[in-house]
Structure formats: C-alpha cells, structure tokens
Amino acid sequence: KSSNEATNITPKHNMKAFLDELKAENIKKFLYNFTQIPHLAGTEQNFQLAKQIQSQWKEFGLDSVELAHYDVLLSYPNKTHPNYISIINEDGNEIFNTSLFEPPPPGYENVSDIVPPFSAFSPQGMPEGDLVYVNYARTEDFFKLERDMKINCSGKIVIARYGKVFRGNKVKNAQLAGAKGVILYSDPADYFAPGVKSYPDGWNLPGGGVQRGNILNLNGAGDPLTPGYPANEYAYRRGIAEAVGLPSIPVHPIGYYDAQKLLEKMGGSAPPDSSWRGSLKVPYNVGPGFTGNFSTQKVKMHIHSTNEVTRIYNVIGTLRGAVEPDRYVILGGHRDSWVFGGIDPQSGAAVVHEIVRSFGTLKKEGWRPRRTILFASWDAEEFGLLGSTEWAEENSRLLQERGVAYINADSSIEGNYTLRVDCTPLMYSLVHNLTKELKSPDEGFEGKSLYESWTKKSPSPEFSGMPRISKLGSGNDFEVFFQRLGIASGRARYTKNWETNKFSGYPLYHSVYETYELVEKFYDPMFKYHLTVAQVRGGMVFELANSIVLPFDCRDYAVVLRKYADKIYSISMKHPQEMKTYSVSFDSLFSAVKNFTEIASKFSERLQDFDKSNPIVLRMMNDQLMFLERAFIDPLGLPDRPFYRHVIYAPSSHNKYAGESFPGIYDALFDIESKVDPSKAWGEVKRQIYVAAFTVQAAAETLSEVA
C-alpha cells in the first residue's frame, strides 16, 4: 500500500496520480526529439543531448541535476582509412570488397557523423588466410569443430553468424581457438522474420544492414584502463597491454549481402547438421578455405580502428526523499546510441524522460517520495556499460550503504507481443501486484489486466497461472548494481513472441535503420506499449521509493534457491561415480537453503505483525530487506571474475546476456569430463559448494531476529 507522510495528495491516490500523468503522446514526442541525429558516446552531439536532458529534468522539477564526467577508453573507426574485408586472388589482388557503409534510410541521406559499421575495440590488423565457418561461435560450436570434426582454427579467419550469445563471447571463443581474425555477419535465419518486408517497408534487416557492437570481455570491469576505480581526473591508467577485456585479433561485422559472397565459395567439410545452416543460398560448408576453383583465393581483413581515451557524461537527477533521504531508488538507462537509437536506447530514454516529468509534476504539487529517487542517463553503455560502471565505482560506498533498488531503462521495446521482466526474486511480488493493477495494451485483452495478458502469452514454466520472470544476466547498465554491488535490480520491456520469431534480438538492432520511423510505423504507432512499459518501470520505482515497508518478499528467494540447488545438483549427478570417489556432497547447500526458507518464513510473519508506527523498528526491518541482496555478495568475487560477486547469479561464462544460477558451481562442473586432473577439478566443485552454502546460510542469518 503506497503512502507517505510528506504529501499533499491523499495517500491512496499517489500511485494513481503518478500513473495518470504518464502520456503516450509525450513519449512519442521525446523519442522523436532524441533520434534525429546520432548520439555516439564521446561525441559532441551526445554531450549536447546530455546538457539538454539536464536542463529539461531541472524544468520538470527535480531537486538537482548534475553531469558526472569520466575519461574512458572508447573505440572509433579511422575516418580516412576505412575498415573492410576482401577476397584476394593468388596475386594478392582484391577481387571482392565488402561495403564501407550501410545505405542510409530514406530521409537521412544528408545526416553527417553516421559511424560506419565496426566492432568496437577491435585491434588494428590486416590478417589474411583461409576462412572457417563456425556457426554462432558458441562454446558448443567450437567443441563440435574441434572434438568431433577435428577442424583446427589455428591461423584461420573465422566467420560467425550473430545471434544466440553476446558477440564478445564469440570473439573470446575464436581467440581461444587460435583464430587470427573474426568476421561477424547477420544471417537472415536470425534477422529476417518470414512474411515481413525489409526496412523501409517493414521491420526486417536489409542485405546491406549491419549490426555494430563492442566485442569486449570486461566481466564487469567498466573502463578497461581503470578496473575497480572511477576514470576521474587523477586516475592511474593501465597501459593498453594491461587493459581489461580487449580482443587480441581483428574483428569486423558485415551484412548478409556481403556474407553471401564469402560463404558461397566455402569448401572443406559439409555442415555437421541442419542447425549449422542459415537461410542464405550457400552450402554453409565449414571449410577451411574455398572450394576447388577458388582454393587459391584467400580472405583479407583491413582493420584500422583506434582506441582513444575520451570524455563521457552521465546525467544524474535527484528527487530527495521526505522521510528517508539516505535511501536511494535508482532509475537508469543509457543515452548513447550507435546511430539514431530509435529503439536502443531512445525508446527507453523517452520513457525515463516521461517518468521524470510525471514525478516532477507531483513534486511541484507538493508531494515528495518517502525515499530519494535518483534518475540517470548513462553514457557509453554501448562501449561496455562504462558510464554506469564508472559512476557506481565512484559512489560505491554510498550505494552499498544506501542503495535500495535499481530499475533499468534501456530499450522499452524489442517487439510488441507481451511484457518481459528480468529481476531479483525479491521483486517478483512487486511486479505481480503492479501488473495486476495496470491495463493490458494488447489486442484481444481490452479491459483485462497486464498480468492476465502477460501470463497468457508468456506463462511461467514452473507455476501455472503466473507469468515467466527471468534471471538477470548482463549486457546492460544494471550489471554493476546487481552483480558487483548486490543492489536489488529489475528490468522490463515489451518483447516479441519467442515461440514464433526465432531471430535474435530484433532484426534492425544496432543498425542505421533503427530510426524513429521504425518505431512509429511498425512497432508501436500509438505508443501504447511504450506507455505500458513506462507504467511498469515508473510504478516499480514509485512503490520502491514510497511504500512504508519495502515491497520485497524474501520467501520468493527461498523458492528459487531450492530450484537452483536442485538444478545444479542434477548437473553434478551426471557424474555419480566421481561424486562418490571425490566425496562430493551437496548436503551443506541443501541444509543452508532449508535454513533460509525457514528463517525467511519467520521474517515474513514478523513483517506482517510489527508496529509500523515505530520508526526505529520500521527502519530495522526495511534494512534487513534492503541488505538481503547485499548478503549474497562474496567480496572475493567469482574465480577469474572479481567484479562478478553475486554468488546466486552471474552472467553466463558462455553468454554475457544470459544469467546463470550458482555460477561458481556451474563453471566448476562445466565440461569437467575434459579436465585432465579430476581430483583438482572435483576439489574446485567442492570448494564452490562450500562458498555457496556458506553464502546462503550467511544471508539467511541476516533475516534472523536481531537479538
């Protein structure tokens, strides 16, 4: 129940007043304003947008709005020396070259400063050699090549299709396999939905469209030159050779027209099975090298991009809390885009802008939230979550003591089918209760709740009558808050129908064709899905900042801990003899989960009964809830990933976008049958079970009665 001591508005109308103030027409207007020119991180245009947002947030009524700047490592193509890939004949002549830019969309022909497609942070180089097609370049794809097909990628240039996993993982895998270059391409099987036209006539990717993106493996480090600390004016910077997460081989992205020219000549081994075939009219041969007539031809990459320390700007707005100003609820999303950012990020930034406007309107009427709300427009997200991470590094001591929750606000839509939510289990009940109060925007669900349409279209695989809520992974600005600092986090957006649309992300992701018109014509002409996402994100922030008792249910954590313990145990039980031989037991983990369940249940009972008029007891109970997420943080971090410190969740080591539960144990068990030294390998499994069991038990004890 929302209420606040310091408001002129009747308590029960607080949330309603806030939600009623949100307008689809405003979101549309803001999106248009944010997408007319590119806003690449580190450019003057993005600095100007930061100042515009600062000014408008002040006008909207926030108490203060400041720019927080950092000097971080970014990457840009060389303007006079373009990147491209060629096929060369035996004399070294270039007989085919990939395109140097995407054909601009209608109406944007005269826009300057459209960065050509490139893989950010690729080193320079001009490798040449035979091509090997590696499917999605996932761990399992390289296992197939290496172990089953006996194909050696050492000294080869590999070509991989985008999709399934984060591109940085693809590059890391290729590097480990000994490749000397990587070509990334968008296959129509993944980026062209059947029955839909290409842009500008539909929302599909044209053959000349290319996905930009960074190829770092930062593992939560932030700026590659200042891991763990803010990239401020007195920062000590590592040398480039010691920088975190930079790729060591040249990488370049291309579209499917150019990919066709490379793949159609491929010889060598046939694809191992149909899962290696895309939708191009090519054989999808694995190689190495070209077929008979073309066997003397090679592929050559020409990469001339440069890494440069560049200033970036976050916008940080504050709406001071009336009762608990030292408790922070954060709503953050990024502002920088690869080109126009029609979806990523400006569909999210426009929603944040409207949420700020609505909160500002209430504040001007005399209302204040109970807790402080911080609003953030992050910079350089596309270059490795740099703006958010640097700010969190600079403010880590405040955040770990005062951070209640972080709600992420990148792209509001990646489709228009149903809601998608990833969050901490602490927020499950908040999301359920909120979506039951909101109207569904979906056709065929008029007059029904968002909860109902969401549950119907995206049912939970475990609990009937409930919607699917996913684990947090990474690839967005919540990472530092959740995975490093242990602040309860969540994200929500509208998504596609994953059952019928098997393509990865949305087809025009990170291309020049991600424009305002893409959204306005094809995804959300009425901006009703944007409005719904604004209501979900804004409603979550409102409740987190305003409810007397924090809207966290620790019992939901108990449920998932049991589920995750069962899952990791069943993975381990694929090795029953080794578990006996090396005395591997999960008893300690299951015992800790049982204790957590019992203590969480008792805590929830006390939460119903305590005297909410006693501010000391109220604060004590709220602090136990706030610090529960923090209790899952291991200060030592995960093995070889010191900035991923959450013991229950981490980004998958094989796909940064995906979340993995009990990641320490999972990674210790992964491919354990190929570890040469089984006693050492199973010893590490035992150590990780110990860490997990201890952490769960320690977290449980934070919920016990304090004395």
Epitope: L176, P576, E673, P678
Partner: antibody
Framework: EVQLVESGGGVVQPGRSLRLSCATS????????MHWVRQAPGKGLEWVAV??????????SYAESVKGRFAISREDSKSTLYLQMNSLRAEDTAVYYC??????????WGQGTLVTVSS | DIVMTQTPLSLPVTPGEPASISCRSS???????????LHWYLQKPGQSPQLLIY???NRFSGVPDRFSGSGSGTDFTLKISRVEAEDVGVYYC?????????FGGGTKVEIK
C-alpha cells in the same frame, strides 16, 4: 578410487581371436572416451584404439596396424570396455592397457593384461 | 604419423643431481585453443605408465614439484631438479595433438 582392471589375455595361436575386457570403477564410465594402448615386450608404448561416448554415437578409430582386425566396444551399464582381436599375428604380442582419456590426455591406466600370439 | 624422438636412450643419474630428457616431434604440436598436447609419463619397473606432466608444463596431482616440463612447437624437455631413487624407470613423451596419438621411444633413467 579410480580403477581399471584388464582381463582376457593369454596365449593364442596366430590367426585366432581373443577378447579383452577392462572393468572400471570410481568414475562415471559412460561420460568418458576410452582407449587401448599396448606395449610389446621390452619395447615402447603404441596407441591401439579409442571409443567415444553415446552422444558421439560410440565412434571409434584405430591404429593402421590393427585396422580391420580389432574392434573396440563398450558396455556402459557394466562400466566395461572391450577389445575384440581377430586374425592375431605374432607382432600383436604385447601387454594391453586400457586407459581413460581426460581432455585429450591418457590419465588413468590399468595394470595391463599380457597377450602372447605364438604357435 | 608424428614421430617422437627422445634423447638420451639411457640416462644414468646420481641421487640429488639434476636430470634432463629431451623430446622432439616431427611436426609442430600446437593445436587450436593454443594448447600443445605434449605429455610425459613414467613407467616404473613392473608397473603401468603414470602421468607426470600434461600439456607441456602442467604437473598432475601428486607429482612432486621436482618434476617440470617446458618447450614449445617441436622441442620439449622434462627436468628433474634433484633425482631421487624412486624416480627410476622409463620416461615416455607422448603427443595427442595429431591422430594417431604417438609415444617417444622412451628414456631409461637408472641410478649410477
């Protein structure tokens, strides 16, 4: 404790057959590629054959010297590896070891069983 | 097939002194993933081979730290910093980068 125990060796005439067994314990046999390696008296080690796991359709490969005559097989339910040796020759005389592969390394070896091919 | 050549054939040693065995392959043993699948085994008299060093330089569990491996490409070395009486036997290098997997001819280490 990981154990591999070979059996089935003995004296056999040239041209005849013999079947070796390797009973294993202490590890989940079905998860691992298994090999046979042999050592002629007073000589060095020679790799003979490998069999993969169920997910790889129990694929096998052989040294040229035994191809077409020897067949490697496994019975996962019994955690046992076999080597069927046909058309035996004098040069097949050796101690035969079964070995468990881990990450492309032969890590654990049995104590061996001696096969003598003699008329 | 890859030929593995070990030198010396025989190595008489004094306890407490260092010893070194060389192994040369007829082709590079560098595999993809940057791995070099060159391993060392010791076969003590009347016993089966036991793994000492895997992938050039990694000591297997329980192997004393007086044993070390080094090398790259085609040239590899096993060193024993201070030989002990229990180290006698035949040492084999082995490559598993290329099929078929092959072994060196062995080096017999005996106490002087």
């Amino acid at each position: 404790e990981v154990q591999l125990v070979e059996s089935g060796g003995g004296v056999v005439q040239p041209g005849r057959s013999l079947r070796l067994s390797c009973a294993t314990s202490g590890f989940t046999f079905s998860n691992y590629r298994m090999h046979w390696v042999r050592q002629a008296p007073g000589k060095g080690l020679e790799w003979v054959a490998v069999i993969t796991v169920k997910s790889d359709n129990y694929g096998s490969s052989y040294a040229e010297s035994v191809k077409g005559r020897f067949a490697i097989s496994r019975e996962d339910s019994k955690s046992t590896l076999y080597l069927q040796m046909n058309s035996l020759r004098a040069e097949d005389t050796a101690v035969y070891y079964c070995s468990r592969e881990l990450g492309q390394v032969l890590v654990f070896w049995g104590q061996g069983t001696l096969v003598t091919v003699s008329s | 097939d890859i030929v593995m050549t070990q030198t010396p054939l025989s190595l008489p040693v004094t306890p407490g002194e260092p010893a070194s065995i060389s192994c040369r392959s007829s082709q590079s043993l560098v595999h993809s993933y940057g791995n070099t699948y060159l391993h060392w085994y010791l076969q003590k008299p009347g016993q089966s081979p036991q793994l000492l060093i895997y992938k050039v330089s990694n000591r297997f569990s329980g192997v004393p730290d007086r044993f070390s491996g080094s090398g790259s490409g085609t040239d590899f070395t096993l060193k024993i910093s201070r030989v002990e009486a229990e180290d006698v036997g035949v040492y084999y290098c082995s490559q598993t980068t290329h099929v078929p997997w092959t072994f060196g001819g062995g080096t017999k280490v005996e106490i002087k």
